[in-house]
């Protein structure tokens, strides 16, 4: 007797797993920036503190009733999908609420960031278990909405953030697009994106995953017994901030970096139509639906790895994007891709002692993204080994020197605009293990990282066809680190990580007459850990 | 996930008559003004102003005063709502958007924000 | 497997007492609300009593305040229903029932009670 | 205390034909109503929670709408395991009351 939503994000074999004390209560406490809440709901009684805090504007119309039912509707709701009894994620959950949304849903920004403040405030004058704090609300982008959500991040804080229900990139709204949240878009029954009238959620790259957010079951403010079910991007993020209430609740250490890394490694992977989003943003959008993690003590140990995609270059000239990972992560290869094709490749770079993974645009280019690898790798230790463009001669290869060091990933870069040279920098597995291999007037960047036990081995997939796009999988056990295209007779635009696949994109010249020699190649640097063993390239 | 999203931002600067009134603020703002994108969410008229990282809690509050002081030569009433340093250092607002520039050139103001509406999802 | 399970009812005096217990097992007991209904022969249903989880809270039938206690024990996993003053217009079937949003999603199969001189 | 009127205490049908039967609260009940199905020497079985939402393995043919006071319990095609007493209850506020019951038989 399961409603949907909980039965998706709860593997079957999870639900009678005891997530929370033998007392039934739980050591996270979750913050929810809401509408007021009946606290007296069955749901939720006993589970639920009203703060003292309330920063919302006025009503607008002179003629607003304020029914305490409906200024409670959305709050009332959220508590208990988080907490609830019957119908929440994270049954033993304390939740504190603070009202930063009127009767008719809406606050201001300054609101919300008095309200970020208070939580901090608390936290220093109280300090206590891990905090989650869930934000089911948007607004456009500011920027200060967001470095608030950055250092209240920086303080262990886990914030879960709404995408947005305005079928539009959650890169515009705020707090969607802070870094440090994380952001949630909605799905249906069938995970499919939800449709809200004429909008839906939101989508983009800075949607982290999506949770069920369509006729969701919860406690209704119109009596203590009363249920109804609501829609939206606020009931998506509550799922996964009920999630992140149990997996701290089991594992109260995890960071944010691992709780994010988590929840996407074990999330439902490909089950989304990806053609309800509009065409630019389907290679931005996350394909994956929240489910509880196992615990860490069944899976601790392996190499995290996420895609964290820059925002696009702009056409001009000069333009760079930039993609960064979180502090904790590490940056294990860095590539781009352009729809256009003219790009003059990528590299890793020092910005304010953070490696960055920067894409470069090329003169006629309608712009690139930056695609950064960042992982989470104890003890890991990276540096880059550059060389410079070739001006003739062979072609010059990239390896890692330094002692117990393997390669993880592969950039390159032209500094001249020929869309002939970028016959891409080579990797070869057959014949030059554990090699970055450059064309002339190629700049080749090999990242090399050292950590107890790494070891990594290349992947290569060939298509001599005409095709689009050649894809190449790590098998089980083994993490994609690394991506890049090795272009056969067309043009390449360039590759990415989605999950654990490289993806190779090309303009297809309709030859298909190809020889194997031509053919375009996935190329993927596969890595595990295994910390008993020593760092080791793998031949194949 | 965002460097600066779908923003407007604004480089105010005070007619130059009005800088020989102004001691202290007589250099040229480097800070920079921020308003939502969306016409219809703005709120003009409150202001977060944010001031560098490194500000110290005490520079808050003098500079939320200076800016008072500002005003009230010029023959605006300001309104102090509240004082941010738990998260980052900064000041609300309640003020005329006039007064804009002369905000922009205060000592450690890195930008202002024109405050804005937040939705329930 | 969800279940509940009430003890033998039986036939009693007017003006006696009797206690009704309800095992439950299949489920955390301590997560809901538990509930008594009733049903004379042949006649509708009658809801008795409940008890929010810790047994803290309780809500009667008006008619049934002062002369029936619902109570449980959490670390037993077993719900009661202690009826004093028994009348003949109690005799009835009398159904365990647990509560999910706040209606009764699992029944015990009943145990009759018959109040006769 | 809320009175529940359930108006019909026996309809009859067909197999195979689509009935509803009506439910109306002496007061205001917003959407907290259940439906249950009881056959003979059985408990009483949960169909239908908060006005409108399936219990869990309940077919889809079992419907519930409405809210306030006035709500309506639909089969849309009855079979021979449907032929059973129908009550509904309202759990908006303790005591919790029940209709009297419509018992559903074949012409």
């Known amino acids: 007797s399961i409603p949907w939503n909980l039965e998706r994000i709860i593997p079957a074999w999870q639900q009678t797993e005891e997530d929370s004390s033998p007392d039934g209560s739980s050591q996270v406490e979750v913050y929810l920036l809401d509408t007021s809440i009946q606290s007296g709901h069955r749901e939720i009684e006993g589970r639920v503190t009203i703060t003292d805090f309330n920063s919302v504007p006025e009503e607008d119309g002179t003629r607003f009733h304020r029914q305490a039912s409906k200024c409670d509707s959305h709050g009332t709701h959220l508590a208990g999908v988080v907490s609830g009894r019957d119908a929440g994620v994270a049954k033993g959950t304390s939740l504190h609420s603070l009202r930063v949304l009127n009767c008719q849903g809406k606050g201001t920004v300054s609101g919300t960031l008095i309200g970020l403040e208070f939580i901090r405030k608390s936290q220093l004058i109280q300090p206590s278990g891990p905090l989650v704090v869930l934000l089911p609300l948007a607004g456009g982008y500011s920027r200060i909405l967001n470095t608030a959500c950055q250092r209240l991040a920086r303080t262990g804080v886990v914030l879960v953030a709404a995408a947005g229900n305005f079928r539009d990139d959650a890169c515009l709204y705020s707090p969607a697009s802070a870094p440090e949240v994380i952001t949630v878009g909605a799905t249906n029954a069938q995970d499919q994106p939800v449709t809200l009238g004429t909008l839906g959620t939101n989508f983009g790259r800075c949607v982290d995953l999506f949770a069920p957010g369509k006729d969701i079951i919860g406690a209704s403010s119109d009596c203590s017994t009363c249920y109804m079910s609501q829609s939206g991007t606020s009931q998506a993020a509550a799922h996964v901030a009920g999630i992140v209430a149990m997996m701290l609740n089991r594992d109260p250490a995890l960071t944010l970096a691992e709780l994010r890394q988590r929840l996407i490694l074990f999330s439902t992977k490909d089950v989304i139509n990806m053609a309800w989003f509009p065409e630019d943003q389907r290679v931005l959008t996350p394909n994956r639906v929240a489910t509880l993690p196992p615990s860490t003590q069944e899976t601790g140990g392996q190499l995290l790895c996420r895609t964290v995609w820059s925002a696009h270059s702009g056409p001009t000239r000069t333009a760079t994007a930039t993609a960064r990972c979180a502090p904790e992560e590490e940056l294990l290869s860095c590539s781009s891709f352009s729809r256009s094709g003219r790009r003059r490749g990528d590299r890793i770079e020092a910005i304010g002692g953070q490696q960055v993974c920067k894409a470069l645009n090329a003169f006629g280019g309608e712009g690139v993204y930056a695609v950064a690898r960042c992982c989470l790798l104890p003890r890991v230790n990276c540096s880059i080994h550059n060389t410079p463009a070739a001006r003739a001669g062979p072609q010059t290869p990239v390896h890692c020197h330094q002692k117990d060091h393997v390669l993880t990933g592969c950039s390159f870069h032209w500094e001249v605009e020929n869309l002939r040279a970028q016959q891409q920098p080579l990797l070869r597995s057959r014949h030059q293990p554990g090699q970055c291999v450059g064309h002339q007037e190629a700049s080749v960047h090999a990242s090399c990282c050292h950590a107890p036990g790494l070891e990594c081995k290349i992947k290569e997939h060939g298509i001599a066809g005409p095709a689009e796009q050649v894809t190449v999988a790590c098998e089980a056990g083994w993490t994609l680190t690394g991506c890049n295209v090795l272009p056969g007779a067309s043009l390449p635009l360039g590759a990415y990580s989605v999950d654990n696949v490289c993806v190779a994109r090309i303009r297809d010249a309709g030859r298909a007459d190809r020889t194997s020699e031509e053919a375009t190649v996935a190329a993927a640097i596969c890595c595990r850990s295994r910390p008993s063993a020593k760092a080791s390239w793998v031949h194949q | 996930q965002d460097e600066d999203g779908d923003y407007e931002e604004l480089m105010l600067a005070l007619p130059s008559q009005e800088d020989s009134l102004v001691d202290e603020a007589s250099h040229v703002a480097t800070a920079t003004f921020r308003r939502c994108s969306k016409e219809a969410w703005r709120l003009p008229g409150t202001y977060v102003v944010v001031l560098m990282e490194e500000t110290q809690r005490l520079q808050v509050e003098q500079t939320a005063h200076r800016l008072q002081t500002w005003a009230a030569r010029r023959g605006y009433v300001i309104k102090v709502l509240h004082v941010f340093y738990d998260l980052f250092p900064g000041f609300l607002v309640k003020m005329s958007s006039d007064l804009l520039g002369l905000a922009l050139k205060l000592p450690h103001v890195e930008y202002i924000e024109e405050d804005s509406l937040v939705f329930a999802q | 497997e969800v279940k509940l399970v009430e003890s033998e009812g039986g036939l009693v005096q007017p003006g006696s007492s009797m206690k009704l217990s309800c095992t439950a097992s299949g489920f955390t007991f301590s997560d809901y609300y538990m509930a008594w209904v009733r049903q004379v022969p042949e006649k509708g249903l009658e809801w008795v009593a409940n008890?929010?989880?810790?047994?803290?809270?309780?809500s009667y039938l008006d008619s049934l305040k002062s002369r029936f206690i619902i109570s449980r024990d959490n670390a037993k996993n077993i719900l009661y229903l202690q009826m004093s003053s028994l009348k003949s217009e109690d005799t009835a079937t009398y159904y365990c029932a647990r509560e999910k949003f706040a209606a009764m999603d699992y029944w015990g199969q009943g145990t009759s009670v018959t109040v006769s001189s | 205390d809320i009175v529940m009127t359930q108006s019909h205490k026996f309809m009859s049908t067909s197999f195979g034909d689509r009935v509803s039967i009506t439910c109306k609260a002496s007061?205001?009940?917003?959407?907290?109503l259940a439906w249950y199905q009881q056959k003979p020497g059985h408990s009483p079985k949960l169909l239908i929670f908060s006005a409108s939402y399936r219990y869990t393995g309940v077919p889809d043919r079992f419907t519930g709408s409405g809210s306030g006071t006035d709500f309506t319990f639909t089969i849309s095609s009855v079979q021979a395991e449907d032929l059973a007493v129908y009550y509904c209850?309202?759990?908006?506020?303790?005591?919790?009351?029940f209709g009297g019951g419509t018992k559903l038989e074949i012409k």
């Open positions: 209850q309202q759990h908006y506020s303790t005591p919790w009351t």
């Open positions: 007061q205001d009940v917003s959407n907290a």
């Open positions: 008890i929010n989880y810790d047994g803290s809270n309780t």
